[in-house]
């Protein structure tokens, strides 16, 4: 194939791949008709003048995972057809001015995972056709004004995993075509008003894992096309009332891992397309009426690991499409009987790791499609008669780690568990805490004939008995339904998939699989 270097493999499709530690310089001679060249995992430390001079038809050049620390300014001369250039995962600290001069067709430039200390406006001034610029995983401490002014066609810019402490409000002002801006894992403490005003086509903004303490009220007011906004793992303690008011296209918002103490009614919205809202690991203590009422299409609401002790009866008004509600690991002692009444499509609710002492008999009265309820590790001594009777789709119920009082009043719960066991997960069985003579015994095998008669006045009202398990073909007698599909945490789609970690349900969000965001 027009002379393929011995260290490389060359395919009929004009693709050349050179790999291996024995390679210490760009192999020669390279086939003149090569359109794609990959130099990977070598010991090349520098690129000298014009090593690619004779392969002017080259469209894609990947020089990745090498020891590359020095590049001569004319290294890419004569590559006027090049559209894709990756220098990712090398050891570059400095980019020579003019390095990309003459690369008039360049659309994608990947400089991620190097050791770059700075960039200058002159670096990219010739790259007027650039659509994608990846600079994440470097050591950049600031971006000078004008650095991206010539990149008017840029649609994707990744500056994540650097050491940026501040951003000039003018640095992105000419990027009117930008769709994706990633600034995650930096050291930003605040974002000046107007920083994103020019980004009228922005669809994704990633600001997670910074040190942002305050959001300017109008920070996102010009970003009407924003679909994904990642603000998790910052120091945000309050949300200005209008900060999310102009985001009609938003469908993913992450705010977990901040210092939010309260949520004011109307703070979210209108956001008719928002499907998921992640608020775990904050300091929220109460939820007022109508706080989520603008989120008509919300399907996932995660409020776990806060300090919620009070939920107003109308807190979840408007959430008619909600499927998953996580309230675990809070400070809830009581719940109003109507608090979930509007959640007609709810399938999973996690209430474990709270201080719930009792539940109203009608707590799940309108939530007929519930498939999973987690109530473990609370202060429950009993549950009202018939509380689960109408939940024909329930296939996972966790009740362990509660101080169940096994007197005669426990019989309805015990009977329900026994008669419905094929539909429930094979989880840890509830154990009696009192009276002393049955402490430690399984609730479902206590001897009913020696159960202590109840002498107390019932604390919670029951509601009318209804068949808990209709004898119809839709619930086959012998079918053992497995556990419902559980939630995953937000995946910000650029995250390295190696961050996947499996967690126990007692862990972060009470769901089994988690991907770090």
């Amino acid at each position: 194939y027009h002379g393929c270097p011995s260290e490389c493999t060359c395919s009929r499709a004009s693709q050349v791949e050179c790999t291996g530690a024995r390679i210490v310089a760009v192999p020669t001679p390279l086939p003149w008709n090569a359109m794609s060249l990959q130099i990977l995992n070598t010991h090349i430390t520098e690129l000298n003048e014009s090593p690619f001079l004779n392969i002017s038809a080259l469209i894609a050049l990947r020089i990745e995972k090498n020891e590359l620390s020095r590049i001569t300014p004319g290294a890419f001369r004569n590559l006027g057809s090049l559209r894709y250039l990756s220098l990712a995962n090398n050891k570059l600290q400095v980019l020579p001015i003019g390095l990309f001069q003459g690369l008039d067709s360049l659309e994608s430039l990947l400089l991620s995972s190097n050791q770059l200390l700075q960039i200058q406006p002159a670096h990219f001034s010739q790259c007027s056709n650039l659509k994608e610029l990846q600079l994440h995983g470097n050591h950049l401490e600031y971006i000078p004004d004008g650095a991206f002014d010539h990149l008017v066609g840029l649609t994707k810019l990744n500056l994540g995993k650097n050491s940026l402490t501040h951003i000039s409000p003018r640095v992105f002002q000419h990027l009117g075509n930008l769709q994706v801006l990633r600034l995650y894992e930096n050291r930003l403490t605040d974002i000046p008003m107007g920083t994103f005003d020019g980004l009228v086509n922005l669809q994704e903004l990633a600001l997670q894992q910074n040190q942002i303490g305050l959001l300017s009220p109008g920070l996102f007011h010009n970003n009407h096309n924003l679909q994904r906004l990642y603000l998790s793992n910052n120091h945000i303690s309050q949300l200005p009332p209008s900060v999310f008011m102009q985001l009609p296209q938003l469908n993913r918002l992450t705010l977990f891992g901040n210092s939010l103490k309260e949520l004011s009614p109307g703070i979210f919205g209108p956001m008719p397309n928002l499907r998921e809202l992640w608020l775990y690991d904050n300091h929220i203590s109460s939820l007022p009426d109508n706080v989520f009422s603008n989120l008509r299409q919300l399907q996932v609401l995660i409020l776990s690991r806060n300090q919620i002790s009070f939920i107003s009866p109308g807190a979840f008004n408007g959430l008619t499409e909600l499927r998953e509600l996580s309230l675990h690991t809070n400070a809830l002692q009581d719940l109003d009987g109507n608090v979930f009444r509007m959640l007609a499509n709810l399938q999973n609710i996690s209430l474990q790791n709270n201080r719930l002492r009792q539940l109203p008999g009608n707590i799940f009265a309108n939530v007929n499609g519930l498939m999973a309820i987690q109530l473990q590790n609370n202060q429950l001594e009993n549950l009202p008669l018939g509380i689960f009777d109408h939940l024909g789709k329930l296939c996972e119920l966790r009740l362990y780690d509660n101080p169940w009082r096994c007197d005669s009043d426990i019989l309805p719960l015990r009977n329900w568990l026994l008669l419905n066991q094929p539909r429930l997960g094979t989880d840890t069985v509830p154990v009696c805490f009192s009276p002393a003579n049955v402490r430690g015994q399984s609730l479902i095998i206590i001897n009913v004939n020696v159960a202590v008669p109840s002498v107390h006045v019932p604390e919670v009202p029951s509601y009318p008995e209804t068949p808990w398990y209709p004898d119809t073909p839709s619930y086959p007698d012998t079918t053992s339904v497995s556990s419902t599909t559980e939630l995953t945490s937000p995946v910000e789609d650029y995250t390295d998939l190696t961050t996947i970690q499996v967690t126990d349900d007692r862990s972060v969000w009470g769901m089994t699989q988690a991907q770090s965001g």
């Epitope: 066991q421 094979t426 398990y469 004898d471």
Partner: antibody
Framework: QVQLVQSGAEVKKPGASVKVSCKAS????????IHWVRQAPGQGLEWMGY??????KYNERFRGRATLTRDTSTSTVYMELSSLRSEDTAVYYC????????WGQGTLVTVSS | DIVMTQSPDSLAVSLGERATINCRAS??????????MNWYQQKPGQPPKLLIY???NQGSGVPDRFSGSGSGTDFTLTISSLQAEDVAVYYC?????????FGGGTKVEIK
């Protein structure tokens, strides 16, 4: 003490129906399941179904022929079996609780032409 | 349906000797870490009486000489020292899932 008292023996013709009662006493009637089990002469035990809080569950072999009902005012449960045939000749028992901890004395139903 | 198979069909044991009855389920009857296997005693002309529930728990008023063991699919009822009043038919039963099914019975007699 806990007692389950069943109605007396019945003789029925094939195609007819029979309704057997089981009156409970000595415990809170609504707190326990009542099962029905039958035993053909010289044979083993066969579970027919249960009733609890007006919810019922049947063995598929008896679905459509057996009907379980209850009257909480009299603490009585009823088992009605229709379209009787000779092989339905058996002693019919009611039994309390999930674990069948107390049983009625049994009601012999004879189906014969 | 879960099929329960008892063995032996009949058993003759001397007074004061140990009697052992086995029951095998066609599939596991364990749930929640508990074995839903029960044992009943039936004397002629009487209704059955609960002896053991959930594999190893004694019913009310049942003498200590009756014990149950096993898990999964294989279970055993043991009468440690057979008494004259223990002559009866013994049935195992699974209550893991509907329809609840009984074994065919084991007749215990005095040798």
């Amino acid at each position: 003490q806990v007692q389950l008292v069943q109605s007396g023996a019945e003789v029925k013709k094939p195609g007819a129906s029979v309704k057997v009662s089981c009156k409970a006493s000595g415990y809170t009637f609504t707190s326990f399941v009542i099962h029905w089990v039958r035993q053909a002469p010289g044979q083993g035990l066969e579970w027919m179904g249960y009733i609890y809080n007006d919810g019922t569950k049947y063995n598929e072999r008896f679905r459509g022929r057996a009907t379980l009902t209850r009257d909480t005012s009299t603490s009585t449960v009823y088992m009605e079996l229709s379209s009787l045939r000779s092989e339905d000749t058996a002693v019919y028992y009611c039994a309390r609780d999930y674990y069948f901890d107390y049983w009625g004395q049994g009601t012999l139903v004879t189906v014969s032409s | 349906d879960i099929v329960m198979t008892q063995s032996p069909d009949s058993l003759a044991v001397s007074l004061g000797e140990r009697a052992t009855i086995n029951c095998r389920a066609s599939e596991s009857v364990d749930y929640y870490g508990i074995s839903f296997m029960n044992w009943y005693q039936q004397k002629p002309g009487q209704p059955p009486k609960l002896l053991i529930y959930a594999a190893s728990n004694q019913g009310s008023g049942v003498p200590d000489r009756f014990s149950g063991s096993g898990s999964g699919t294989d279970f055993t009822l043991t009468i440690s020292s057979l008494q004259a009043e223990d002559v009866a038919v013994y049935y195992c039963q699974q209550s893991k899932e509907v329809p609840y099914t009984f074994g065919g019975g084991t007749k215990v007699e005095i040798k």
